[in-house]
C-alpha cells in the first residue's frame, strides 16, 4: 500500500495505490483511491508512467481528456467514470502486455488540494493448474498442467500424507514455449503415487502462486485449484 500526500501550495489530499500484477492478454486494473470531492467537475485524475513522455490517461471536468495521451496507451485505458465521485481513480488497461510493467503515478487534483502516489505494476502470465491421473503411464502417475506462465515458474509437489517430503527425485517438470513466444505451458509429472492421498502441484513465480490439488481414492477422484497474486502491497 502506498499512501501519497499532496505537496506545497494548496492543501494536500491522501492518494492510495496498491501494487498489482497484470496477466498478459487480459484487461488489468491499476488501483488508486483518493479523498472524494463533492463536485465531479473539480476532480482531475492523471495517470503517468515512468519513462513515458505522454500521459497514460487523464480525466477532468467529468470526462476523459486524451489529447496528451501517449501513443502506447491509445485506445487501451479507462477510468470508472461513475465511481470517480466516490474517490475511485483506478485505471482499466486493455490487453496487458509485458511492456506495460513499470512504475505508474496516480496524480489527483480536487477542490481540497493535490496528492499523488506511485504504483509498481508487474506483468506476466499465470493460469490455474489442472491435475489428472495419467492412465497412459506404466505406474501410478499424476500429471499437472497449466497453459500459460511467465516468467518461468518453479513447480513443487507436496502430499498430505508425506508432509515435508521432497518429491523432486520422483517428478519431472517441463516448460514448453507457447506460439506467441512469450508465455510457456507448464507440465509436471509425479511418479510412484499412492492411493488414498491428496497431492498438490504448486506453481509459483514472482507474480502469482497457483495450486492444483487431487485426492485419489479407490472409488473417486476429487480436484481443486486456486490462484493467488503475490504482490498486492498498498502504498
Amino acid at each position: 500500500l502506498i499512501i501519497g500526500f499532496g505537496i506545497s501550495g494548496r492543501h494536500s489530499i491522501t492518494v492510495t495505490t496498491v501494487a498489482s500484477a497484470g496477466n498478459i492478454g487480459e484487461d488489468g486494473i491499476l488501483s488508486c483511491t483518493f479523498e472524494p470531492d463533492i463536485k465531479l467537475s473539480d476532480i482531475v485524475i492523471q495517470w503517468l508512467k515512468e519513462g513515458v513522455l505522454g500521459l497514460v490517461h487523464e480525466f477532468k471536468e467529468g470526462k476523459d481528456e486524451l489529447s496528451e495521451q501517449d501513443e502506447m496507451f491509445r485506445g487501451r485505458t479507462a477510468v470508472f467514470a461513475d465511481q470517480v465521485i466516490v474517490g475511485n481513480a483506478s485505471l482499466r488497461l486493455k490487453n496487458v502486455q509485458l511492456t506495460d510493467a513499470g512504475t505508474y503515478k496516480c496524480y489527483i487534483i480536487t477542490s481540497k488540494g493535490k496528492g499523488n502516489a506511485n504504483l509498481e505494476y508487474k506483468t506476466g502470465a499465470f493460469s490455474m493448474p489442472e491435475v489428472n491421473v495419467d492412465y497412459n503411464a506404466s505406474s501410478e502417475t499424476l500429471r499437472c498442467e497449466a497453459p500459460r506462465w511467465f516468467p518461468q515458474p518453479t513447480v513443487v509437489w507436496a502430499s498430505q500424507v508425506d508432509q515435508g517430503a521432497n518429491f523432486s527425485e520422483v517428478s519431472n517438470t517441463s516448460f514448453e514455449l507457447n506460439s506467441e513466444n512469450v508465455t510457456m505451458k507448464v507440465v509436471s509429472v509425479l511418479y510412484n503415487v499412492t492411493i488414498n492421498n491428496t497431492y498438490s502441484c504448486m506453481i509459483e513465480n514472482d507474480i502469482a502462486k497457483a495450486t492444483g490439488d487431487i485426492k485419489v481414492t479407490e472409488s473417486e477422484i476429487k480436484r481443486r485449484s486456486h490462484l493467488q497474486l503475490l504482490n498486492s502491497k498498498a502504498s
Epitope: 496477466n23 498478459i24 492478454g25 487480459e26 484487461d27 490517461h57 470526462k63 476523459d64 486524451l66 491509445r74 485506445g75 487501451r76 485505458t77 479507462a78 477510468v79 467514470a81 461513475d82 482499466r92 486493455k94 490487453n95 502470465a125 493460469s127 497453459p147 500459460r148 507457447n178 506460439s179 506467441e180
Partner: antibody, heavy 116, light 109 residues
C-alpha cells in the same frame, strides 16, 4: 499482409451444429482479442464471442451455452462451434481482430442459414 | 446493459455537404473504448475512428470523431460519393463486453 479468411458457413437445420473457421495471416492470433460478430439479413452488427490473448472467453447472452469460441495457436486459426442452432442465428458471421485500436481487421464473412 | 442509440436512423445528404452522426450511450463509456465503423453493402465493416477521436490507418481526414461520456459524434466534413454507407458506433468494456449501435444509413439525397 494482415488478413482474416472465414469458412464453414452453410445451410443447416434447426437444432443442428456447425463449426466456423477463421484463418489469420500477417499477425499472431493469440496476442490479440479475437471476436466473432454477426449480421442478420438487413440488420445491424451484433457481437457474438471473444477469446482474449490469455485464452479466456466471453460470449453474448444470446449464444451462451450454445456457441463456443476457441483457437488453435499452431494453425493461427480462430473457431466458432455452434450447437443447437435456431432460425434467429441466421446471419453473416465475421471474425474480427480487436487490436489496441478497435476492431481493425475483419474477414469477408461466411453465411450461416438455419432453416428446415 | 449498455445500449448505444444512433441518430438519425437515415441521413439524406448530397456530395460536398457536411454529415453529423450521433451516438448516445445509456451510461458513461470511456472515450478510449468508443469506435466508429463504416459498412458498404456486401462488404465487411471498416474501422474509421477509435478512442472516440483518433482516425484509423488510411482513413481520410474528412472523417473526425468527438465526444465523451454518453454523447459521441462522427463528422464527415465534406461528403464524397464513396462515403454513402451505413455507420456504426461501438463500445468496449461494459456488459455485454462489446455493443454496437443500430446504425445510421447515410444516403444520397
Amino acid at each position: 499482409e494482415v488478413q482474416l479468411v472465414e469458412s464453414g458457413g452453410g445451410l443447416i437445420q434447426p437444432g443442428g451444429s456447425l463449426r466456423l473457421s477463421c484463418a489469420a495471416s500477417g499477425f499472431i492470433v493469440s496476442r490479440n482479442y479475437m471476436n466473432w460478430v454477426r449480421q442478420a439479413p438487413g440488420k445491424g452488427l451484433e457481437w457474438v464471442s471473444v477469446i482474449y490473448g490469455s485464452g479466456r472467453t466471453d460470449s453474448a447472452d444470446s449464444v451462451k451455452g450454445r456457441f463456443t469460441i476457441s483457437r488453435d495457436n499452431s494453425k493461427n486459426t480462430l473457431y466458432l462451434q455452434m450447437n443447437s442452432l435456431r432460425a434467429e442465428d441466421t446471419a453473416v458471421y465475421y471474425c474480427a481482430r480487436d487490436g489496441d485500436y478497435g476492431m481493425d481487421v475483419w474477414g469477408q464473412g461466411t453465411t450461416v442459414t438455419v432453416s428446415s | 446493459e449498455i445500449v448505444l442509440t444512433q441518430s438519425p436512423g437515415t441521413l439524406s445528404l448530397s456530395p460536398g455537404e457536411r454529415a453529423t452522426l450521433s451516438c448516445r450511450a445509456s451510461q458513461s463509456v470511456s472515450s478510449s473504448y468508443l469506435a466508429w465503423y463504416q459498412q458498404k453493402p456486401g462488404q465487411a465493416p471498416r474501422l474509421l475512428i477509435y478512442g472516440a477521436s483518433s482516425r484509423a490507418t488510411g482513413i481520410p481526414d474528412r472523417f473526425s470523431g468527438s465526444g465523451s461520456g454518453t454523447d459521441f459524434t462522427l463528422t464527415i466534413s465534406r461528403l464524397e460519393p464513396e462515403d454513402f454507407a451505413v455507420y456504426y458506433c461501438q463500445q468496449y468494456g461494459s456488459s455485454p463486453l462489446y455493443t454496437f449501435g443500430q446504425g445510421t444509413k447515410l444516403e444520397i439525397k
